[in-house]
């Protein structure tokens, strides 16, 4: 059980107040984290509270401003990047968001040696992506879907690609589906470790069907937004990987990296690129049917002036019980010999663990093992491997950082974080300097987040980087809800849940219950993290019990649970939420006439199906930006879990798993359907089809659309959304306003 430390004493009770919705909407109780921008083994940059860019040297204890807030302000810079030779800084301004990761911006180059902006051969605007080489001060950037190279910031650019075209050919940046569902980045170019080569992806979207929606804006006529967006079963982007020698870019030009034959024989994806050395690169490919992944190690052949990917350096990863990997196929972390690597994949017992691959995957040496999962490899040095896992005390929703000594035999394992601040900190991530000389630990909870700096050899804490003192003080007179994380054992399935209880919770009383669900494949909602959010307010002020349940399909508890939903989305995720609700009712403190469910995105899909399950458990529910049919969602994501919507594959379940097919079952629940009209991700089409089916079935429901808003419903829409949902729930639960 994780109970927030209680600061409530009877004598103080009248000075304490509940959370208000305004607190949440204003972000009054938001926390800060500190991630050093490492620039060497012992130095990092950080943007100070007054917006100066400050360089800190851990070993000398000295710090100095490398870029003043005055310079930043002169071009309205919101971001910066120091060149590795420390001669230049790029300043980023005019940020304009595109999709989840992508944005365009204007870039200015500031010369630190003379304290002036570089004049002559200025960068065009707006730029889609820009980055320094890892050594020196070469620049690569993407403008109008083409890649350009500058040997020095003041030099004229060398144009690498010429075929870039809006919505057709993307060079060095991903198209919509690769950005959202495969790379999870705004870029698709990668410098080799010393900047000799530049690798990049070219995405050809010429044949992809286009999603078109209206953007209403302020004009007389709405604009139409067109995005090449492959839905399940549709034509996919065609990807090619090229590498160019940046020292002599015109000599042989970009050289294409060959695709492994077993991958190229049918539709495929490129999933990631990892440089090993300047002359060795590792590419990962994935069949369109995403249960086969191939890792291909390629070497530069000087005699060919191109890249050789011998079959002996192809490593196949295949899943026979589900899809390859977790959410994504894991990426390799290479060791110092530049050929062997560490990688997380399922062991024979179906738990994701670190393996060491020297020659073949079949001969992989398992480094970690147990009925828990290794989650991320942070860094491999010559004598240590740092990783995170949820091993400690068998709580899947925790994250601790471990060090395995690989320099000695047998390797020994040490938990770096398990006992540091045990009550406060059970969910960590880490950020390492070069050669892991130092590292920062960022603790996300369950207590107030704290960021600390540590010595990479001894693990000794050097200093606190951010401890959120102001937040701690602000919360002193707030009645926060209690939180507990426990598990239910049902039919050989373990259902972990988090329950958020009103501050004066009394087990002998009855409380309305709200289920918050996401439930997507390889997700995790039950995590030991700190949050003061909308559901905290509902528990604190409105006296609701809120529960989050990780059912089948969720992550980090083994493949049996994860792959249970393979090819049948919308079945077990819903069943497990319902099962959990029944168990909560048995606990005796839930008012079974006042149970609601809500979710966003995949959670909106699950909440809709739960409401339409015909169990009579739920009085009401909310779906925000739900998927309503898997035929409407992106190919890369959907097909990973569902296969293809074809007769000879899985069309039947595509049809059976729609929300629309259950329209009749909404008759006995109060349903609030919400969607942004400019949702590029889960298209408004999804909710439009639900609404149409409900109208055709003559079922009453409530709905709210947010004009010109995307999947995130940000800005003023957020305030309106949570206010509207609060009213809906209070009405459903007969709570006075």
């Amino acid at each position: 059980i994780v109970l927030r430390p209680s600061r409530v004493h009877n004598s103080e009770e009248n000075t304490m107040r509940a959370l208000t919705l305004k607190d949440i909407l204003n972000g009054t109780f938001s926390y800060k984290t500190f991630f050093p921008n490492w620039i060497s083994g012992q130095e990092y940059l950080h943007q100070s509270a007054d917006n100066n860019i400050v360089l800190y040297n851990i070993e000398t204890g000295q710090s100095y401003t490398i870029l003043s807030n005055r310079t930043m302000k002169s071009v309205n810079a919101s971001n910066y990047g120091l060149s590795p030779d420390r001669q230049f800084v790029y300043l980023e301004s005019d940020y304009s968001k595109l999709w989840r990761y992508s944005y365009t911006a204007t870039y200015y180059i500031y010369d630190l040696s003379n304290g002036e902006f570089v004049r002559g051969n200025e960068l065009p605007r707006p730029i889609q992506y820009l980055c320094w080489s890892p050594v020196g001060s070469k620049l690569a950037y993407v403008y109008q879907n083409n890649i350009y190279l500058k040997q020095r910031p003041g030099d004229p650019p060398f144009q690498i690609t010429f075929n870039g075209r809006e919505n057709k050919i993307f060079n060095g940046i991903p198209d919509w589906v690769y950005e959202e569902e495969m790379l999870a980045t705004k870029y698709a170019l990668w410098w080799s470790p010393n900047g000799k080569f530049l690798a990049y992806a070219e995405f050809n979207d010429t044949d992809i069907p286009v999603i078109a929606y209206s953007y209403y804006g302020d004009e007389q006529y709405p604009r139409t937004i067109n995005i090449p967006y492959p839905k399940a079963g549709a034509k996919n982007p065609v990807v090619r990987i090229f590498i160019i020698d940046t020292t002599y870019p015109a000599y042989v030009g970009p050289q294409e990296v060959p695709v492994p034959a077993m991958i190229a024989s049918s539709d495929y994806y490129f999933s990631w690129l990892t440089w090993v050395t300047d002359e060795r690169v590792c590419l990962q490919w994935l069949k369109r049917v995403q249960n086969v992944s191939v890792l291909s190690i390629c070497d530069f052949r000087e005699d060919w002036q191109t890249w050789d990917c011998p079959k002996t350096q192809e490593h196949i990863e295949e899943s026979r019980t589900g899809w390859a990997g977790g959410f994504f196929v894991s990426t390799p972390v290479f060791s110092y010999d530049a050929i062997s690597y560490y990688k997380i994949f399922s062991d024979k017992d179906g738990y994701k663990h670190i393996h060491y691959i020297k020659d073949t995957v079949e001969n992989a040496i398992q480094i970690t093992s147990g009925k828990w999962e290794a989650i991320n490899i942070f860094r491999v040095t010559q004598d240590s491997l740092f990783y995170s896992s949820n091993e400690f005390e068998e709580y899947p929703g925790r994250r601790n950082i471990y060090r395995i000594s690989i320099g000695s035999y047998p390797p020994s394992k040490k938990c770096v974080t398990c006992h540091l601040r045990k009550e406060r900190c059970q969910y960590y991530t880490a950020s390492f300097s070069d050669y892991a000389k130092y590292y920062a630990l960022v603790c996300y909870g369950p207590g107030i987040p704290i960021s600390t700096l540590h010595d990479g050899r001894t693990d000794q804490e050097i200093k606190i980087l951010e401890e959120n003192k102001e937040l701690e003080n602000a919360l002193k007179n707030i009645q926060l809800p209690k939180e507990e994380i426990k598990k239910l054992e049902v039919d050989e399935i373990t259902l972990w849940y988090k329950m958020i209880l009103p501050p004066q919770f009394d087990r002998s009383k009855k409380y309305p219950l709200l289920i918050q669900v996401y439930g997507g494949p390889c997700s995790q909602s039950v995590r030991s993290v700190f949050a003061v959010n909308w559901i905290s307010y509902l528990a604190s002020k409105e006296g609701m019990v809120i529960a989050l349940v990780d059912g089948r399909g969720t992550a980090f508890q083994g493949d049996k649970l994860l792959y249970a939903v393979y090819r049948k989305l919308g079945v077990y995720e819903v069943e497990d939420q319902i099962t959990a609700v029944r168990k909560f009712i048995e606990m005796g403190f839930i008012d079974e006439k006042r149970i609601a469910i809500w979710g966003w995105s995949y959670g909106g899909y699950v909440s809709s199906l739960a409401l339409a399950s015909g169990t009579g458990l739920f009085k009401c529910g909310i779906a925000v930006a739900p998927v309503s049919s898997w035929e409407y969602y992106a190919s890369v994501y959907t097909e990973r879990f569902m296969g293809l919507p074809t007769k000879d594959d899985n069309l039947e379940h595509y049809k059976n798993s729609t929300v629309m097919a259950r329209a009749e079952y909404f008759r006995n629940v109060d349903y609030l359907l919400i969607h942004g009209t400019a949702d590029d991700n889960v298209h408004f089409q999804n909710s439009a089809q639900i609404a149409k089916a409900l109208v055709n079935a003559q079922v009453d429901f409530q709905a709210m659309w947010y004009s010109d808003q995307n999947h995130g419903l940000s800005g003023l829409s957020t305030n309106h959304l949570y206010t509207h949902m609060t009213h809906f729930l209070k009405q459903c639960f007969s709570l006075s306003d």
Epitope: Y248, A264, W304
Partner: antibody, heavy 120, light 111 residues
Framework: QVQLVQSGAEVKKPGASVKVSCKAS????????IHWVRQAPGQGLEWMGW????????KYAQKLQGRVTMTTDTSTSTAYMELRSLRSDDTAVYYC?????????????WGQGTLVTVSS | EIVLTQSPGTLSLSPGERATLSCRAS??????????MHWYQQKPGQAPRLLIY???NLESGIPDRFSGSGSGTDFTLTISRLEPEDFAVYYC?????????FGQGTKLEIK
């Protein structure tokens, strides 16, 4: 036009060293790999290794490793091949050859050859 | 290393005839992009001369009666109509893997 001109014939005693030169002209010397290939009397061709004058990259045939050294002088556009600890079976015509730009391993221009005789 | 075996060792033909020379590799010398096999002609007392590169590409200045074909492990050099100056030794060479290797040669002689 591209030309590779090699140094003259040499007679060496077993255990001695020989250094053959290959002067290039008619193209940018630093752009193309120079290969060294030898041919024993009445025998076939044997690849000895390569040197890239631009990058300094060198690859030697395993069987000659430790006995052969390839170098270049970019100021004179000349490549050199030195073979040490000579044995009688090193008697051969030694050729330098230019790596074809787009040939990816083919050799498009060859020197006239240098006969090295190893005899006591 | 990759061993190249040429056949026949000697080929006796008359001018005007068609010559077919074969080269077999001990393992594939092809990738999805190219076949890394090249052909040379050598006359007595002369350096080799490049005829065909990457299995089928005719080097500039070489008469088009010379052609190359094949992929994987089996390659062929064809001379469609023999001219008197074509009688020489022909070598195949692979650059798929280091070390580069040559075949032992096929001697094309006048019948």
């Amino acid at each position: 036009q591209v030309q590779l001109v090699q140094s003259g014939a040499e007679v060496k005693k077993p255990g001695a060293s020989v250094k053959v030169s290959c002067k290039a002209s008619g193209y940018t010397f630093t752009e193309n790999i120079i290969h060294w290939v030898r041919q024993a009397p009445g025998q076939g061709l044997e690849w000895m290794g390569w040197i890239h004058p631009g990058s300094g990259s060198i690859k030697y045939a395993q069987k000659l490793q430790g006995r052969v050294t390839m170098t270049t002088d970019t100021s004179t556009s000349t490549a050199y091949m030195e073979l040490r600890s000579l044995r009688s079976d090193d008697t051969a015509v030694y050729y330098c050859a230019r790596h074809a730009g787009t040939g990816r391993g083919a050799m498009d221009y060859w020197g006239q050859g240098t006969l090295v005789t190893v005899s006591s | 290393e990759i061993v190249l075996t040429q056949s026949p060792g000697t080929l006796s033909l008359s001018p005007g005839e068609r010559a077919t020379l074969s080269c077999r590799a001990s393992q594939s010398v092809s990738t999805s992009a190219y076949s890394y096999m090249h052909w040379y002609q050598q006359k007595p007392g002369q350096a080799p001369r490049l005829l065909i590169y990457l299995a089928s590409n005719l080097e500039s200045g070489i008469p088009d009666r010379f052609s190359g074909s094949g992929s994987g492990t089996d390659f062929t050099l064809t001379i469609s109509r023999l001219e008197p100056e074509d009688f020489a030794v022909y070598y195949c060479q692979q650059s798929r893997e280091l070390p580069y290797t040559f075949g032992q040669g096929t001697k094309l002689e006048i019948k």
